[in-house]
């Protein structure tokens, strides 16, 4: 069986000219393509990859929704030679990208990383943008997390960064066959510079904090360990949350996936894949359905096969 | 139909400048990865440059690294090529080309730059 | 010096079978990039003619085919007419370079 091949982060890897074919080993019969757009109301990004896979054939489109940020995965796995280039890896302007002071900021300020690599997408590095309300919905809250794809033996994954609905989620996710979105939220200015320590605590269990002494001559003592900042509204004195040394799980590491739950959906990823190629980087994905801009999305897509050449 | 139309070539002298345009209709522009070709006169095809649907992704030939700009307006359907401190070899006609399938499936119908003193 | 060489020329008459070669390198055609080729008809933009190796955009003649092995290529053009006269590009995609890179072209001349 010979596929298509290439892996993309954000906006190049599985760009047109990048395609690359590959002959699969023995007992590999399908091909796969596996894409997971992410939509911030900042702007958005995919990761794709396409490569020989194994299962069934079939499909498996999933839309997701982790506190407003929205996610779209598609999966296709067929049996023909070269037959994974059907979904649509091209990313459709984002309204309002480019428009946003059409829309009233709400006061909150985060960092934003949309298709940034890793590397770009440190600290304070990234831009920082001005939350808006947008589709009904308040985003007041800060995120930091990764989004993850996994196919074809190929594990990718990217930062994001962004605006949020909520302002206290830990480390929480949403996931789709090889596909995962997960991350914590903040409230604060800027707050979501890092937030792969940050502890999650029961409601019922008030955290553990450090009081500082009744006098206002000393300041107070502040844990030195803590990545993650506490910000109040109201003129109280800030404190700092000791972090117990054992919650120290990062959402950087992708999830692991139900394979019964995939192979119900008509397609898997699970087993081994002949060599992949291509380099990181292009694109979007087609398709979500919330927001109001659904009809810039050509739903599952297909390859854009040259009607004509010519001029 | 799709069609791209450049505009923008002339005479410059070395050193100078030009901005080329092209414009795009019949397709999606926004979803397109777009590029220029340039073919010196009587000579063969030259990649120069890159650009994803986004404008996020950039690549330039080696060879105009530095001096030129590739940038593209989705809102009007233009992709733009910005040349500075032209050179006596960047003297060709300047197609640019749209990405299908893996290929530039469209073609304009070039504009020609000449850069002599 | 172009990145994937071509010959410079190739002739045949009307009826003939004629092949173009394109050879590129680990980086290009051998790294698994797959192959496109242009017509570019005398004083007109290129035209695609095959892309992905081996296919064919609609309109074009299935008189046209293309094929890859290893780090080399082809373009084969059967049941030669006039109209075919015209300089032919192959392209792929280069790590070294990052970017598409061209073949040299060929010139092919119909005779008589």
């Known amino acids: 069986l010979e596929c298509y091949s290439c892996v993309q982060k954000a906006d190049d890897g599985c760009s047109p000219h990048r395609m690359k074919t590959v002959k699969c080993g023995p007992g590999v019969d399908v091909c796969t393509e596996a894409v997971g757009a992410v939509e911030t109301i900042h702007g958005q990004f995919s990761v794709a990859v396409r490569g020989c896979g194994s299962g069934i054939p079939g499909k498996n489109d999933r839309g997701l929704d982790l506190h407003g940020l929205l996610a779209f995965f598609q999966l296709q796995q067929c049996s023909e030679d070269r037959c994974n280039a059907k979904l649509n890896l091209t990313l459709r302007g984002l309204n309002p990208a480019g428009n946003e002071s059409a829309y009233e900021p709400n006061g909150a300020e985060c960092y934003s990383c949309v298709g940034l690599s890793r590397e770009k997408c440190q600290g304070s590095m990234p831009p920082v943008v001005n939350c808006y309300n947008a589709s009904g919905r308040v985003y007041k809250g800060c995120f930091d997390g990764n989004v993850t794809l996994t196919a074809a033996n190929v594990t990718v994954s990217l930062p994001v960064r962004g605006c949020v609905q909520d302002e206290t989620c830990t480390r929480d996710g949403v996931t789709g066959p090889g596909f995962t979105l997960s991350g914590s939220c903040c409230q604060g200015p800027r707050c979501n510079a890092d937030l792969r320590n940050k502890t999650y605590f029961s409601p019922r269990i008030p955290p553990l904090v450090l009081l500082p002494p009744p006098t206002t001559a000393a300041p107070s003592t502040r844990a030195q360990n803590s990545s993650s900042t506490t910000s109040t509204a109201a003129p109280t004195t800030t404190t700092s949350i000791i972090k117990p040394t054992t919650a120290q799980a990062s959402h950087t590491s992708p999830h692991e996936m139900d394979l019964e739950v995939i192979q119900e959906e008509g397609a898997s990823l699970s087993g081994g894949a002949a060599g992949h190629g291509g380099t990181a980087g292009h694109g979007g994905a087609a398709g979500h359905q919330d927001r109001s801009n659904m009809e810039k999305y050509p739903g599952k897509g297909g390859a854009q096969i040259p009607a004509k050449g010519g001029s | 139909e799709v069609q791209l139309l450049e505009s923008g070539g002339g005479l410059v002298q070395p050193g100078g400048s030009l901005r080329l345009s092209c414009a795009a209709s019949g397709f999606t522009f926004s979803n397109a990865w777009m590029s220029w070709v340039r073919q010196a006169p009587g000579k063969g095809l030259e990649w120069v440059s890159y650009?994803?649907?986004?404008?996020?992704?950039?690549y330039y030939a080696d060879s105009v690294k530095g001096r030129f700009t590739i940038s593209r307006d989705n809102s009007k359907n233009t992709l733009y090529l910005q040349m500075n401190s032209l050179r006596a070899e960047d003297t060709a006609v300047y197609y640019c080309?749209?990405?299908?399938?893996?290929?530039?499936?469209?073609w304009g119908q070039g504009t020609l730059v000449t850069v002599t003193s | 010096q172009s990145v994937l060489t071509q010959p410079p020329s190739a002739s045949g008459t009307p009826g003939q079978r004629v092949t173009i070669s394109c050879t590129g390198s680990s980086s290009n055609i051998g790294a698994g990039y797959v192959v496109h080729w242009y017509q570019q008809l005398p004083g007109t933009a290129p035209k695609l003619l095959i892309y992905d190796n081996n296919k064919r955009p609609s309109g074009v003649p299935d008189r046209f085919s293309g094929s890859k092995s290893g780090t080399s290529a082809s373009l084969a053009i059967s049941g030669l007419r006039s109209e075919d006269e015209a300089d032919y590009y192959c392209?792929?995609?280069?790590?070294?370079?990052?970017?598409?890179?061209f073949g040299g072209g060929t010139k092919l001349t119909v005779l008589g």
């Open positions: 080309a749209r990405e299908g399938l893996w290929a530039f499936d469209w």
């Open positions: 650009i994803s649907s986004s404008g996020s992704t950039i």
């Open positions: 392209a792929a995609w280069d790590d070294r370079l990052n970017g598409p890179v």
